[in-house]
Interface confidence: low
């Protein structure tokens, strides 16, 4: 007699939504061998039994997870082979926060992996990398796990977040850190990586002081071309924090992003504007200090932001977000900059 299982591995990892067939067969000198799968949580419709063989079809659903056993018998002889099936989900859906790091200050960095299964700390690991090495001095905080809100029931996917306390980045600051998430499965290791760019001064590693109007730039592989205004401030489009939700935001030149302009009609005011077609809205999502202390007007594809009471704009980073799509544009305003009537 010969007893064979194909594929022969005792542990098989199957990506959610993909299919796999496991064939168990046995030849028998004395008539037809009895071959069947047992220990199945899945419906019996996923097993096709033929004379001398049995085919288990795994459909890449979470309900396929388990350890079925193929039992083959021929006369008084019997054989068994167990296959541990693990269905996993690990899409490239990493979201990092903040979108960029500022040198010279302590900060908390978070990295979230979305739509994960299994949500097991033993399977999933996070690392904060500088180049190819783990960043020294970063303190990993307790990871968080939460069930994702799913459109379809019966698919309990999770999001897992790792946070780090990050001490002040040294000088010169590195161009970027990376969050790396690794899923370790039987005989399979999967890795996704997301860049967290670090702000760099164009002239000096030091952050700008109150008398300097030198702009900061983001050094990031995903940084788009900066757009300058007459105030000598720089807008810095950054990569979308998650996959785009609408094909309307796509173009051959990359995603359409909001633009930030200076508006002098009513004192010191910033205007964020989207020109990506109908149905797009913009809103201010970040400003130095508390965003609630600013005067905001939001009207569809335009959003204004001004200081209350009217006066010079506060030094720091401003961010405008566009929906759908989630693309953001960042603007750094150096200290002691007053509006110039000749600016456009």
């Amino acid at each position: 007699q010969s007893f064979q299982v194909n594929p022969p591995e005792s542990e098989v990892a199957v990506a959610m939504g993909t299919s796999l067939q496991i064939t168990c067969s046995m030849s028998c000198d004395e008539g037809v061998a009895r071959v069947h799968w047992r220990g199945l949580d899945t419906s019996l419709g996923s097993v096709q039994t033929l004379p001398g063989s049995s085919i288990l079809s795994v459909r890449g659903m979470l309900s396929d997870t388990g350890t079925p056993v193929c039992v083959g018998s021929c006369g008084s002889r019997s054989f068994q082979h167990s296959v541990k099936i693990l269905v996993y989900a690990f899409p490239d859906q990493l979201v990092v926060s903040p979108e960029f790091l500022v040198p010279g200050q302590d900060q908390v960095v978070s990295c979230t992996a979305h739509n994960i299964w299994p949500a097991d700390p033993n399977s999933l690991s996070f690392a904060l990398l500088l180049g190819e090495q783990r960043l020294e001095g970063a303190q990993a905080l307790e990871p968080e796990q939460e069930e994702e809100i799913q459109e379809a029931e019966g698919t309990p996917l999770f999001r897992m977040t790792q946070r780090w306390r990050l001490p002040s980045l040294g000088t010169p600051a590195p161009p970027a850190l990376h969050c790396q998430v690794t899923m370790q499965l039987p005989k399979l290791v999967l890795t996704h990586r997301k860049e967290i760019p670090v702000l760099q001064s164009q002239t000096s590693p030091k952050p700008p002081n109150t008398t300097s109007a030198e702009p900061y730039i983001l050094t990031s592989s995903s940084t788009a071309e900066a757009v300058s205004t007459g105030l000598n401030i720089t807008t810095l489009p950054s990569a979308p924090p998650y996959p785009k939700l609408s094909p309307r935001t796509l173009s051959s030149e990359g995603p359409c992003r909001p633009k930030i302009h200076q508006d002098l009609e009513a004192g010191w005011e910033l205007l964020c504007e989207a020109s990506c077609g109908p149905g797009v809205t913009v809103r201010w999502t970040l400003a130095p200090g508390d965003l609630a202390t600013y005067h905001k007007r939001e009207a569809g594809a335009q959003a204004w932001l001004s200081v209350l009471p009217p006066g010079p704009m506060v030094e720091g980073w401003f961010q405008c977000r566009q929906d759908p799509g989630g693309e953001v544009t960042n603007l750094y305003v150096p200290g002691q900059v007053t509006p110039n009537s000749s600016s456009t």
């Epitope: 047992r38 220990g39 388990g66 350890t67 079925p68 068994q80 167990s82 541990k84």
Partner: antibody, heavy 118, light 107 residues
Framework: EVQLLESGGGLVQPGGSLRLSCAAS????????MHWVRQAPGKGLEWVSS????????DYADSVKGRFTISRDNSKNTLYLQMNSLRAEDTAVYYC???????????WGQGTLVTVSS | DIQMTQSPSSLSASVGDRVTITCRAS??????LAWYQQKPGKAPKLLIY???SLQSGVPSRFSGSGSGTDFTLTISSLQPEDFATYYC?????????FGQGTKVEIK
């Protein structure tokens, strides 16, 4: 909620017969292998018999082969164990159990006591 | 038949103790092993399956390890409700067989 409820135990003379039943509820009975496991007073657990979801695959422990018959009625969500030619060593609490994954039992009934004595 | 041998047969321990029970199979059974807890007059309760997978709802202080012929059940910090008898069970080949049990008693 998954529930397994055995019945049919009692006192019987050696050589006599009993039929145990196990009523299942709270899950799709017809999708699971079911087993009988017994435990003699003060002793350990002993696997007795198993039956496949459709009833086509049946196995017995050597100690009961030829005397016990396992069966199931999926329309009634019930598992049976027909015990003939009972012996004193068959005295035990009989549990029905649901098998999942790698032939382990995630749910058990509360047990029914079978006493074989003259 | 595959024989399953548990050791020790009984042990006395205190609340908070780390307890280890071993189970040895007479031949290799891969990871086809389960652990059960049984209290007097009650049905067994599944703790561990596949040698190391924790059954849903079972406290994380229970853990299982091993493969082939040697297996271990560990209770990291014994609680009052853990005093019971523990059984291993092989599910690699027929007939399924259980260990003789390990009784965990209060010291």
């Amino acid at each position: 909620e998954v529930q397994l409820l055995e019945s049919g135990g009692g006192l019987v003379q050696p050589g006599g017969s009993l039929r145990l039943s196990c009523a299942a509820s709270g899950f799709t009975f017809s999708s699971y292998w079911m087993h009988w496991v017994r435990q003699a007073p003060g002793k350990g657990l002993e696997w007795v018999s198993s039956i496949s979801p459709g009833g086509s695959n049946i196995d017995y422990a050597d100690s009961v082969k030829g005397r016990f018959t396992i069966s199931r009625d999926n329309s009634k969500n019930t598992l049976y164990l027909q015990m003939n030619s009972l012996r004193a060593e068959d005295t035990a609490v009989y549990y029905c159990a649901r098998e999942v994954q790698l032939s382990h039992y995630d749910y058990w009934g509360q047990g029914t006591l079978v006493t074989v004595s003259s | 038949d595959i024989q399953m041998t548990q050791s020790p047969s009984s042990l006395s321990a205190s609340v908070g103790d780390r307890v280890t029970i071993t189970c040895r199979a007479s031949q290799g059974i891969s990871n086809s092993l389960a652990w059960y807890q049984q209290k007097p007059g009650k049905a067994p309760k599944l703790l561990i399956y596949g040698a190391s997978s924790l059954q849903s709802g079972v406290p994380s202080r229970f853990s299982g390890s091993g493969s082939g012929t040697d297996f271990t059940l560990t209770i990291s910090s014994l609680q009052p409700e853990d005093f019971a008898t523990y059984y291993c069970q092989q599910a690699n080949s027929f007939p399924f067989t259980f260990g003789q049990g390990t009784k965990v008693e209060i010291k």
